[in-house]
Amino acid sequence: ERLPLTPVSLKVSTNSTRQSLHLQWTVHNLPYHQELKMVFQIQISRIETSNVIWVGNYSTTVKWNQVLHWSWESELPLECATHFVRIKSLVDDAKFPEPNFWSNWSSWEEVSVQDSTGQDILFVFPKDKLVEEGTNVTICYVSRNIQNNVSCYLEGKQIHGEQLDPHVTAFNLNSVPFIRNKGTNIYCEASQGNVSEGMKGIVLFVSKVLEEPKDFSCETEDFKTLHCTWDPGTDTALGWSKQPSQSYTLFESFSGEKKLCTHKNWCNWQITQDSQETYNFTLIAENYLRKRSVNILFNLTHRVYLMNPFSVNFENVNATNAIMTWKVHSIRNNFTYLCQIELHGEGKMMQYNVSIKVNGEYFLSELEPATEYMARVRCADASHFWKWSEWSGQNFTTLEAAPSEAPDVWRIVSLEPGNHTVTLFWKPLSKLHANGKILFYNVVVENLDKPSSSELHSIPAPANSTKLILDRCSYQICVIANNSVGASPASVIVISADPENKEVEEERIAGTEGGFSLSWKPQPGDVIGYVVDWCDHTQDVLGDFQWKNVGPNTTSTVISTDAFRPGVRYDFRIYGLSTKRIACLLEKKTGYSQELAPSDNPHVLVDTLTSHSFTLSWKDYSTESQPGFIQGYHVYLKSKARQCHPRFEKAVLSDGSECCKYKIDNPEEKALIVDNLKPESFYEFFITPFTSAGEGPSATFTKVTTPDEHSSM
């Protein structure tokens, strides 16, 4: 019968920071030079031996004379209570198939971490623990005096625990959150009555969970250095120097090299010239609580991120073409670069790709004259595209070219005794057609009746009109825009000797918010187009004169512009242009984009006052300068009489009072005889014009008293 192999020489040490017990023991009576598989059962008690809090088995192979080790971590700080440990063993080896039995228990080993031997009457543990967010933590207080009332607070809120013995209370904090990097404050206060016997604060340092680095990537710009970058995620540094920011280490498995990175989100790795092409990097993030790693495997030639091109220049720049040149940093022999050019100008963007070896060149064509362009270039490895370099760019401006289009020209002709006054207008050329800065306009006036006679007027830009006084001959007028390079095509109009403003009836039209819709009868005979011009009816023609060209096959158009204002009357004239470029006035139209109610009331005179009648007149009232077409007038009359006079009807005013109202439908009828009145009677009247938008402003009534019959005779 074999001797039971009882564990002996059990020694228990502690690690307060890790809250762990470390057991060491040996097994007696083990055969010399023999190995046995054994199972050890370990019991741990707290406060007293009968209070077993943990039982577990530990299986291992035991050699002769071997010292065995085993550790256990306590959720309760070891300073909170005395612990007891004992151990027994069982042979569990195929070499001994007969029934095995447990040895006797070793004697209890008492473990007491005496950190509550100071002079205080209250101790709180652990003093200074570091855990990860979401961990469960147990804390405790040890009170010397059981008569004391002890209250504990976590971040100012009282917490309640479980009494382990009269002196010790433990608190279980579940899934502790991160509150601040200076830790979570916990304190306990012992008091008797209202007298503080002592206060003790501890800090539970809760670290954010270390994240796996994201977007880990490495690349080279010169085959000398690999530049690796990553997103480190949350910084897990804690205050009071408890935990620094996480560290980052690069490990390359093929070379076995390792490098501690000095930056939190990038690291440079020197490429050795031993033609290593494939790299297998592990990036390890580490803080006091855990490690996280991420891996990338790549071929060096597939990770080329070029330095941006340099020496971007433009050669042979003219009005429509330029040659763009640039240089790239040479990184290897026979390296082919793919370069992308972006050309920005006039609100457009063009993109071109080109393959190059050392120096880049690209012919930029179909450019606009006198235009500033921004051209930029970026390059990449053409063989194994990884990513584009940064852009390198430069601005350049194409040269001017002669203006490409004739100015848009129109005129106003007014007849004066013995001559024509022609006011000539032109619109500035668009940038697209000016091809540079317009410096001046040449106006050539040629008398068609005397062909040899012509005059040149040079008008500096930016003027856009000129006045010509011509006799009663026919004239051809050419307008040419000039820049530093040359002249535009001529714009030609002809002023005929015949008076052109023959009487044409003016037609009233109603505009809309969108503008004016105009239509006209086609001009008999050949026309090369129509011109509609317009201006504010009440202002000097030159102030806001506008025109629009319309094609020969069109007899309607919509004039829409933000310049049309409500309550303003606009006059339109429609001309037909003959093949000889002579304008013929076809129609006149006038109207408001939006009519408004009259802005003022007429000044009314009372005439011929008799005992039975009086006359009202407002001859001076102008219907022209109103914010709408005056359609007529409303005459309001108040008197003591119950009934309204003939032709008047009952009306209610805005203030609710009653009166009599007479409507005049003719805007030019500016007088009214009010008769059938009583002598010595009191009357009040008020006259207001109206448009389609309503009446004029309300005003006070004017008082009239009829005389007695005697005095009126």
Epitope: K127, E155, K182, N185, Y187, S241
Partner: antibody, heavy 120, light 110 residues
Framework: QVELVESGGGLVQPGRSLRLSCAAS????????MHWVRQAPGKGLEWVSG????????GYADSVKGRFTISRDNAKNSLYLQMNSLRAEDTALYYC?????????????WGQGTTVSVSS | QSALTQPPSASGTPGQKVTISCSGS????????VNWYQQFPGPAPKLLIH???QRPSGVPDRFSGSKSGTSASLAISGLQSDDEADYYC???????????FGTGTKVTVL
């Protein structure tokens, strides 16, 4: 009885040094952070320096950084403040204070102070 | 230059309530617990309130502390003549890496 007794103050010329000591008794010294706080005549309180229970964390006011050094000897229940390159504006009553906790919570026990006068 | 600002003085008649404000920033009051100290002429200061609103045993419940955002306040209700003293707020400042006191408020009982 919890007690803090400061010593080492005195009259000193500008540019010279002084070492303040604080003897602690009546409590478990190594369970608490400790501080030095000063008060110039007729002025408010100014925190000078603090040291955590195990000296793992030390802090200084900007006005003394690089000139003053705080230290503690837990075996001797003592706190020290080494003051170098003293200036006239360092003239004050220097208090030694015990914290509630292992780091910087708040000061629940104060000594009576020791006077430092810096003058030529 | 203190990082925490207090009114220089406050006063009230016996029985009245007096409130002292303490204004800081996100790096001090905004991120750290606030303490209040009472100092009579002569002796050393005394801890009155810690952790924003906690009264150590022995401090009358007439004293109460509160904190909101980057400001804190100390209220003394039922003012008594022996409350006449200087009061200081204080908090750890993360950007200065220092414990900062307020400018101090002298409370007078009229």
């Amino acid at each position: 009885q919890v007690e803090l007794v400061e010593s080492g103050g005195g009259l000193v010329q500008p540019g010279r040094s002084l070492r303040l000591s604080c003897a602690a008794s009546g409590f478990t010294f190594d369970d608490y952070a400790m501080h030095w706080v000063r008060q110039a005549p007729g002025k408010g309180l100014e925190w000078v320096s603090g040291i955590s229970w195990n000296s793992g964390s030390i802090g200084y006011a900007d006005s003394v950084k690089g000139r003053f050094t705080i230290s503690r000897d837990n075996a001797k229940n003592s706190l020290y403040l080494q003051m170098n390159s003293l200036r006239a504006e360092d003239t004050a009553l220097y208090y030694c204070a015990k914290d509630i906790g292992v780091y910087y919570y708040g000061m629940d026990v104060w000594g009576q102070g020791t006077t430092v006068s810096v003058s030529s | 230059q203190s990082a925490l600002t207090q009114p220089p003085s406050a006063s009230g008649t016996p029985g009245q309530k007096v409130t002292i404000s303490c204004s800081g920033s996100s790096s001090n009051i905004g991120s750290s617990p606030v303490n209040w100290y009472q100092q009579f002429p002569g002796p050393a200061p005394k801890l009155l309130i810690h952790s924003n609103n906690q009264r150590p045993s022995g401090v009358p419940d007439r004293f109460s502390g509160s904190k909101s955002g980057t400001s804190a306040s100390l209220a003394i209700s039922g003012l008594q003549s022996d409350d006449e003293a200087d009061y200081y707020c204080a908090a750890w400042d993360d950007s200065l890496n220092a414990y900062v006191f307020g400018t101090g408020t002298k409370v007078t009982v009229l």
